[in-house]
Interface confidence: medium
C-alpha cells in the first residue's frame, strides 16, 4: 500500500511540475501579449452585447408569432377536423367563437346600439343571433346572463323580421309578458323596434339606440369554411 501511495505521489508531483511550467509559459505569453488580450476581451464583450440584442429580437419575434398563432391555426385546425372525418364532419368555429349545434356564436364583452351590433356581426360574416328553439334560447341565456343582449329581430319597417330572413310568424318566440309593447315612454325618442333578451331569458322590444351587449351567429357548412 505504501508503494502504491509513493507511486501516486510521484505521479502528482510530475503533474504539478507540468502544470507549473505550462502555467509559467502562459503567464509569460500574457505578459508579452497583454494588449491583445485586452482587445480580445473588448471584442468578446461587443460580440456578447450583439448576441443579447439578437436574442431580444428573436424573443420579440417569438412573442409576436405566439400572439398570432391561434388565428393562423384556425384554418389548419378546421381542415384537420374535416380530413379526419373524410369530409362528413362540419368544420370547427373560428377562435373566440363557441360551437353549438351546427352554429358558431360570438358573445360581446361590451355594448353597442342594435344597428352597430348588427354591422359588427356582418363584418365577421355573421349576423345578430336568430333564436330558433327553446334549446338555443337556453344556450344563449347561459352565456349572456345577467346582461341585456341584442338579438337579430327587428320591426323597424313595420313588421317583425329576423335578420337572416327566418320566418317570424311560425318560428319560436319568447316574449316577456305584455311584450312587445312598442313603448314610447322612455324619453329616448322614437318607438321600440329592436329586440333584446333580458337576464331572465324573456324577450323585450327596446329602443334601438340603447347600448347593450350582443351575440353574433354564423352557420357552419361542410366545405371546410364557416358560412
Amino acid at each position: 500500500q505504501s508503494a502504491q501511495l509513493q507511486a501516486e505521489l510521484r505521479s502528482l508531483k510530475e503533474a504539478f511540475s507540468n502544470f507549473s511550467s505550462s502555467t509559467l509559459t502562459e503567464v509569460q505569453a500574457i505578459s508579452t501579449h497583454g494588449g491583445s488580450v485586452g482587445d480580445k476581451i473588448t471584442s468578446l464583450g461587443a460580440k456578447l452585447e450583439k448576441q443579447q440584442q439578437d436574442l431580444k429580437a428573436d424573443h420579440d419575434a417569438l412573442l409576436f408569432h405566439l400572439k398570432h398563432f391561434p388565428v393562423d391555426l384556425r384554418f389548419v385546425a378546421c381542415q384537420m377536423e374535416l380530413l379526419h372525418s373524410n369530409g362528413s364532419q362540419r368544420t370547427c368555429c373560428p377562435v373566440n367563437w363557441v360551437e353549438h349545434q351546427g352554429s358558431c356564436y360570438w358573445f360581446s364583452h361590451s355594448g353597442k346600439a342594435w344597428a352597430e351590433a348588427e354591422k359588427y356581426c356582418q363584418l365577421e360574416n355573421a349576423h345578430l343571433v336568430v333564436i330558433n328553439s327553446w334549446e338555443e334560447q337556453k344556450f344563449i341565456v347561459q352565456h349572456t346572463n345577467p346582461f341585456n343582449t341584442w338579438i337579430g329581430l327587428t320591426d323597424s319597417d313595420g313588421s317583425w323580421k329576423w335578420v337572416d330572413g327566418t320566418d317570424y310568424r311560425h318560428n319560436y318566440k319568447n316574449w316577456a309578458v305584455t311584450q312587445p309593447d312598442n313603448w314610447h315612454g322612455h324619453e329616448l325618442g322614437g318607438s321600440e323596434d329592436c329586440v333584446e333578451v333580458q337576464p331572465d331569458g324573456r324577450w323585450n322590444d327596446d329602443f334601438c339606440l340603447q347600448v347593450y351587449r350582443w351575440v353574433c351567429e354564423k352557420r357552419r357548412n361542410a366545405t371546410g369554411e364557416v358560412a
Epitope: H68, V71, D72, R74, F75, P94, N96, S108, H109, S110, G111, K112, E116, K119, Y120, Q122, L123, E124, N125, V211
Partner: antibody
Framework: QVQLVESGGGVVQPGRSLRLSCAAS????????MHWVRQTPGKGLEWVAI????????YYADSVKGRFTISRDNSKNTLYLQMNSLRAEDTAVYYC??????????????WGQGTTVTVSS | DIQMTQSPSSRSASVGDRVTITCQAS??????LNWCQQKPGKALKLLIY???TLETGVPSRFSGSGSGTDFTFTISSVQPEDIATYYC?????????FGQGTRLEIK
C-alpha cells in the same frame, strides 16, 4: 414577419380613376378584415373603408361613398382600393392596415408604409 | 361621427422626462382606443390597444389608461428614439376616427 406593401399611387387628373393595391405577407390574410386609411397634412389621418375577411361586407367613409370600392383577392393575399371620380381633396398618402383581433372593435394592428396619390390638373 | 380631441398638439421634453398625452372622445367608446406612433417616413406602429394593453414587443415605458370618454397615454421616461407623432384612434364604431396627433420633440 407581418408585412403590408401598398402600390399603385401616382399623379392623376380630377375625374379620373386609380387602383391601389396592398400586398400582404407573413400572416393568414384570409383570416383578417382590412382597412384603407389616408393621411393629408391638412386633415390628418382619415379612415376610408373596411372590408370583412371574406370580402362580403364593406363600409365606407361618407366622403368616398359611391366613388371608392374596397375589394380583396384572398388567393393572391391582396387588398384593393378602386378610386373613381377623383377630386383634389383625395390627394393623400394611402395606407392599408390590418384589422386587429380586439374583442368587439375595428382597430388596426399592422400598417403599411403608404402610397402617395396626387390629384391635380 | 365620434370626434377625438387630442392634446397637446406638440410637446418638447428632455431625455428621462415623463410625458403625458390626453385624448377625449365626443361619446362613450368603452375601451376601444388605440395609441399609435408615427416616425417620419415610417409606417404607423401600434403601441397600445384596448386603451391600456401594451402591444407585443413595445417597451414598458409606454402605457395607456382610461375608459368611456377620457384617455391618457404616458411615456414614463422619454428616450431619444421616441421622437415621433403620436395618435389616438377610436374603433368602437365606423367611421373610425383619429386624434389630430401630438408631435414629440427632444430638447
Amino acid at each position: 414577419q407581418v408585412q403590408l406593401v401598398e402600390s399603385g399611387g401616382g399623379v392623376v387628373q380630377p375625374g379620373r380613376s386609380l387602383r391601389l393595391s396592398c400586398a400582404a405577407s407573413g400572416f393568414t390574410f384570409s383570416s383578417y378584415g382590412m382597412h384603407w386609411v389616408r393621411q393629408t397634412p391638412g386633415k390628418g389621418l382619415e379612415w376610408v373603408a373596411i372590408i370583412s375577411y371574406v370580402g362580403k361586407n364593406k363600409y365606407y367613409a361618407d366622403s368616398v361613398k359611391g366613388r371608392f370600392t374596397i375589394s380583396r383577392d384572398n388567393s393572391k393575399n391582396t387588398l384593393y382600393l378602386q378610386m373613381n371620380s377623383l377630386r383634389a381633396e383625395d390627394t393623400a398618402v394611402y395606407y392599408c392596415a390590418r384589422r386587429g383581433n380586439s374583442y368587439g372593435g375595428y382597430g388596426m394592428d399592422v400598417w403599411g408604409q403608404g402610397t402617395t396619390v396626387t390629384v391635380s390638373s | 361621427d365620434i370626434q377625438m380631441t387630442q392634446s397637446p398638439s406638440s410637446r418638447s421634453a428632455s431625455v428621462g422626462d415623463r410625458v403625458t398625452i390626453t385624448c377625449q372622445a365626443s361619446q362613450d367608446i368603452s375601451n376601444y382606443l388605440n395609441w399609435c406612433q408615427q416616425k417620419p417616413g415610417k409606417a404607423l406602429k401600434l403601441l397600445i390597444y384596448d386603451a391600456s394593453t401594451l402591444e407585443t414587443g413595445v417597451p414598458s415605458r409606454f402605457s395607456g389608461s382610461g375608459s368611456g370618454t377620457d384617455f391618457t397615454f404616458t411615456i414614463s421616461s422619454v428616450q431619444p428614439e421616441d421622437i415621433a407623432t403620436y395618435y389616438c384612434q377610436q374603433y368602437d364604431n365606423v367611421p373610425i376616427t383619429f386624434g389630430q396627433g401630438t408631435r414629440l420633440e427632444i430638447k
